[in-house]
């Protein structure tokens, strides 16, 4: 059964991002995941971030210098911005963002949380706080071995959620997992509120249209 996975708050206070580890999720086809830029809280500095969908080697190196694919910018302290990823088997239109089953995909930020560091393309909280999400699509959390993993690149989508698909004729590349040290997110049913966000297109060819 399709589930709303536990939302991930993109904040340095989020205990899911454990030191030296990533946050791994095991979405099934049909699942949805919300990534949230929390709104400002009185008495606490607002954290500014740009989130990217990146290749595994970029996630490992904490570098978004090449082919940066912006998903969402957290620069609106007055709003809780909710960005929804839907792990969908087939995209309904020609610009569908499709992710293959049994592949890994990575989201991270190389911003450091300050406004001045918003556009940083190296290091940032990816390095200092290991704020990375690893999405292991259609995989069994008890049966994953790093050497069996490959990663492909998704194509574009023009809907309001990131559409994950098991078949991606336009995708290319076969790249392995990073270090295998990840924090697992609880995949219990959640009924998170709000409308969904979306993902990035791609002027530089990182994604491939069908």
């Amino acid at each position: 059964l399709a589930k709303n996975l536990e939302p991930v708050s993109w904040s340095s206070l989020n205990p899911k991002f454990l030191s030296g580890k990533g946050l791994v999720i095991y979405p099934k086809i049909g699942d949805k995941l919300d990534i949230i830029c929390p709104r400002a809280e009185a008495g606490r500095p607002y954290e500014y971030y740009k989130l990217y969908l990146v290749r595994p080697e970029q996630a490992a190196a904490c570098s978004t210098v090449l082919d940066p694919n912006v998903l969402v910018t957290c620069n609106r302290p007055e709003q809780e911005i909710r960005f929804t990823i839907k792990f969908q088997e087939f995209s309904p239109n020609y610009m569908g963002l499709e992710f293959k089953k049994h592949h890994d995909y990575y989201i991270t930020s190389t911003s450091n949380g300050s406004l001045e560091g918003l556009e940083n393309r190296e290091g940032g909280v990816c390095r200092t706080r290991t704020m990375k999400i690893i999405m292991k699509v259609g995989q069994d959390p008890n049966a994953v071995t790093p050497e069996q993993l490959t990663t492909s690149r998704p194509s574009k989508e023009a809907d309001n959620t990131v559409k994950m698909a098991t078949q991606a004729p336009g995708s290319r590349g076969s790249l392995g997992d990073s270090d295998g040290k990840h924090e697992t997110v609880n995949q219990e049913e959640k009924s998170g509120p709000g409308a969904s966000g979306g993902s990035s297109g791609d002027p530089d060819g990182f994604f491939n249209s069908k």
């Epitope: 500095p45 910018t73 406004l115 309001n160 409308a195 966000g197 002027p203």
Partner: antibody
Amino acid sequence: QIQLKETGPDLVQLTQTLSITCTVSGFSLTTYNVHWVRQTPGKGLEWMGAMWNGGRTDYNSAFKSRLSISRDTSKSQVFLNMNSLQADDTAKYFCARLDYWGQGVMVTVAS
Amino acid sequence: ETVMTQSPTSMSTSIGERVTLNCKASQSVGIDVDWYQQTPGQSPKLLIYGASNRHTGVPDRFTGSGFGRDFTLTISNVEAEDLAVYYCLHYGSIPFTFGSGTKLEIK
């Protein structure tokens, strides 16, 4: 209740400086950002710049070095100053938190 | 800078109809797009932020969608009070940039 209110002149002479004050209530300038946007018949809505919660300012390069934004947090005020005004600077000037906007002040540049 | 191109420039619709307004970014902007409504003589009002998040108090007949370069604002069951100009805004990088607007007229 969140409010933003612009106060400034209706008329500014050609080549002179425009000064507008945005007074906010219901929120803190050290937590939220305030943007300046103007609306001209020819160009529609145009983002001019921002005073960010931490005190940093960013500007639209279209205004080159003519534009300056500052604030006084103790008075909950943000200031816009723009010099060397030309006829095409005639516009309605808004301050905004983006989720909430002031009513705007209509400024005419006259010779 | 990112250029936001809105289409159509203006459109006419009837009460109860469904309309779709478009905004295209010159480069990929993720979901960093707002939609604003400006009724005659008023300040702009935020409808949608982050491409599809509805602002507090906005009727659910207003729906935003899209990401990357293509964004839409859909108004289902148009009401007379929806007569306005609608603007999209890209806020993900400096300078923030507005589209030129779509004027919605009621027949």
